[in-house]
C-alpha cells in the first residue's frame, strides 16, 4: 500500500488577520507531503498546495471570497515523491481542520495612526485604514468597506510629562479630541468589533506616535 | 436563494407578551446582521435594532430599547422581536431584514412582514 | 441621533420624465477611513415589503434598473430617476447606514400624473 508508512496530520490550526489566511498543522514531515483541501459548509473540496512538504498552506484567496462563509479544511498525508495515480483507490489519510468563519473569527491587524493635527486646544487624529484582500469586482477592499459600523477604533492618550491616560472612541477613522495647550501628548490606537465577543474583539495597540515629532502639524 | 420568512399575523390584547420570528434561509445565517423595522398604519419607516446571530450582539433604538427584546437562535436560523406587555401604539407592521454583504450596504433583503394589532 | 430629511414629500411625475428626490441628514454620513458615504435608499412599492435600490449612496444594488441612479456626499444626496415607468411607483426612502441608531427619512411618495 502506497501510505502505510505516512501520518495523519494533527493540530490543525487557522491563523488569519486582516482576512490574510494560513492554515498550519503538524507535524513536520520525514517522507511524507500534503495537500489541503477547503469547502464551503455546501460546496465543493478545493485542492490546494499540492504535494507540500509544508506545514502551512496559504487559503486567503479560497477564503475571499466570500468572508461570511464559514469553510472546512483538511490535510491529507502521502508518501515523499507521491505522484498520483489513476488507478489508486485507497483515501490517504487526512486530518479535518476546525470550521473557520473569517468575518467572525479574523484577527484585526495592528492599526496605524496616519497622521495628527493639533488646531488650538483640539487635536485630530486620523487612523489609516488597512487594505484586505477581499475584492469587490477588481477592487480591494479596506477594513472599514468590509466592517462598516462594526469596526470602531479606541484612541488612547496622555500627556507626555504624566502617564495617566485617557480614552476616545470612534466609529469612524477620525478623532477630535481637547488637549492643554502648551503640552505634548502621545497617541496610540486600537481596533475594536464591539460585536464579538471572544479574544479576536481586540487588535493589538498600534505604535505609539507624540507630538513633536514627524507626523503631527501644529498651527495656532 | 436568501429568504427571510416572517411568522404569521398576531391579535393581541394590550399588557400580553408576544415574540414573533424571522427564519432565515440560503445563506451563512451567523454573520449577517438582522434588523427589525416598525412601519405604523400609513407611516414611514422606523428602525428597531439589531442582532448579529453568530455572537449574539444587539443594538437598540433608544426609543425602542427597554420596551422590546432582539433575540436569535442560530441554531435554527431564527431571529425573533418579543414584547412583555403590549400596548395598542405597537399595533403596527414588523419586518426583519438582512443587513448587505459589504460594510454599511443596507438591508439586502426582507421579510414579508409580520402584522401585530393591540386591541382591547 | 442623525435626522434625515427628505423632499419632496409628493411627487406627482408623467411616465417617461425624469424625477428626482432630495434628502438631507444633520450629520455627514462620510466615513474618514474609505471616504464611502453611508447613505442607502429604498422603494417600498403599494403592498410590498420596501427594497434596497441604492447603497454608499451611488452603487446600484445588483437587479436594480440603471434609470435609477444616486449621488451626493455629506450631508446632501439625490436619487434620480432619468425615465419614471408605472412600476416605479411606491414610497422612496433614504437612510443613515452610517451610526447607530440608523434613522430613516420621513418617505417620499411618487405617483403617477
Known amino acids: 500500500s502506497g501510505t502505510t508508512n505516512t501520518v495523519a496530520a494533527y493540530n490543525l490550526t487557522w491563523k488569519s488577520t486582516n482576512f490574510k489566511t494560513i492554515l498550519e498543522w503538524e507535524p513536520k514531515p520525514i517522507n511524507q507531503v500534503y495537500t489541503v483541501q477547503i469547502s464551503t459548509k455546501s460546496g465543493d473540496w478545493k485542492s490546494k498546495c499540492f504535494y507540500t512538504a509544508d506545514t502551512e498552506c496559504d487559503l486567503t484567496d479560497e477564503i475571499v471570497k466570500d468572508v461570511k462563509q464559514t469553510y472546512l479544511a483538511r490535510v491529507f498525508s502521502y508518501p515523499a515523491g507521491h505522484v498520483e495515480s489513476t488507478g489508486s483507490t485507497e483515501e490517504p489519510p487526512y486530518e479535518n481542520s476546525p470550521e473557520f468563519t473569517p468575518y467572525l473569527e479574523t484577527n484585526l491587524g495592528q492599526p496605524t495612526i496616519q497622521s495628527f493635527e493639533q488646531v488650538g486646544t483640539k487635536v485630530n487624529v486620523t487612523v489609516q485604514d488597512e487594505w484586505t484582500l477581499v475584492r469587490r469586482n477588481d477592487t480591494f477592499l479596506s477594513l472599514r468597506d468590509v466592517f462598516g459600523k462594526d469596526l470602531i477604533y479606541t484612541l488612547y492618550y496622555w500627556k507626555s510629562s504624566s502617564s495617566g491616560k485617557k480614552t476616545a472612541k470612534t466609529n469612524t477613522n477620525e478623532f477630535l479630541i481637547d488637549v492643554d495647550k502648551g503640552e505634548n501628548y502621545c497617541f496610540s490606537v486600537q481596533a475594536v468589533i464591539p460585536s464579538r465577543r471572544t479574544a479576536n474583539r481586540k487588535s493589538t495597540d498600534s505604535p505609539v506616535e507624540c507630538m513633536g515629532h514627524e507626523k503631527g502639524e501644529s498651527r495656532e | 436563494e436568501v429568504q427571510l420568512v416572517q411568522s404569521g399575523a398576531e391579535v393581541k390584547k394590550p399588557g400580553e407578551s408576544l415574540r414573533i420570528s424571522c427564519k432565515g434561509s440560503?445563506?451563512?445565517?451567523?454573520?449577517?446582521?438582522i434588523e427589525w423595522v416598525r412601519q405604523m398604519p400609513g407611516k414611514g419607516l422606523e428602525w428597531m435594532g439589531d442582532?448579529?446571530?453568530?455572537?449574539?450582539?444587539?443594538n437598540y433604538s433608544p426609543s425602542f430599547q427597554g420596551h422590546v427584546t432582539i433575540s436569535a437562535d442560530k441554531s435554527i436560523s431564527t431571529a425573533y422581536l418579543q414584547w412583555s406587555s403590549l400596548k395598542a401604539s405597537d399595533t403596527a407592521m414588523y419586518y426583519c431584514?438582512?443587513?448587505?454583504?459589504?460594510?454599511?450596504?443596507?438591508?439586502?433583503?426582507w421579510g414579508q412582514g409580520t402584522l401585530v394589532t393591540v386591541s382591547s | 441621533d442623525i435626522v434625515m430629511t427628505q423632499t419632496p414629500l409628493s411627487l406627482p411625475v408623467t411616465p417617461g420624465e425624469p424625477a428626482s428626490i432630495s434628502c438631507k441628514s444633520s450629520q455627514s454620513l462620510l466615513s474618514s477611513g474609505n471616504q464611502k458615504n453611508y447613505l442607502t435608499w429604498y422603494l417600498q412599492k403599494p403592498g410590498q415589503s420596501p427594497q434596497l435600490l441604492i447603497y454608499w449612496a451611488s452603487t446600484r444594488e445588483s437587479g436594480v434598473p440603471d434609470r435609477f441612479s444616486g449621488s451626493g456626499s455629506g450631508t446632501d444626496f439625490t436619487l434620480k430617476i432619468s425615465r419614471v415607468e408605472a412600476e416605479d411607483v411606491g414610497v422612496y426612502y433614504c437612510?443613515?447606514?452610517?451610526?447607530?441608531?440608523?434613522?430613516f427619512g420621513q418617505g417620499t411618495k411618487l405617483e403617477i400624473k
Open positions: 440560503g445563506y451563512t445565517f451567523i454573520t449577517y446582521w
Open positions: 442582532i448579529l446571530p453568530g455572537s449574539g450582539s444587539t
Open positions: 437612510q443613515n447606514d452610517y451610526t447607530y441608531p440608523l434613522t
Open positions: 431584514a438582512r443587513s448587505g454583504y459589504y460594510g454599511n450596504s443596507g438591508f439586502a433583503y
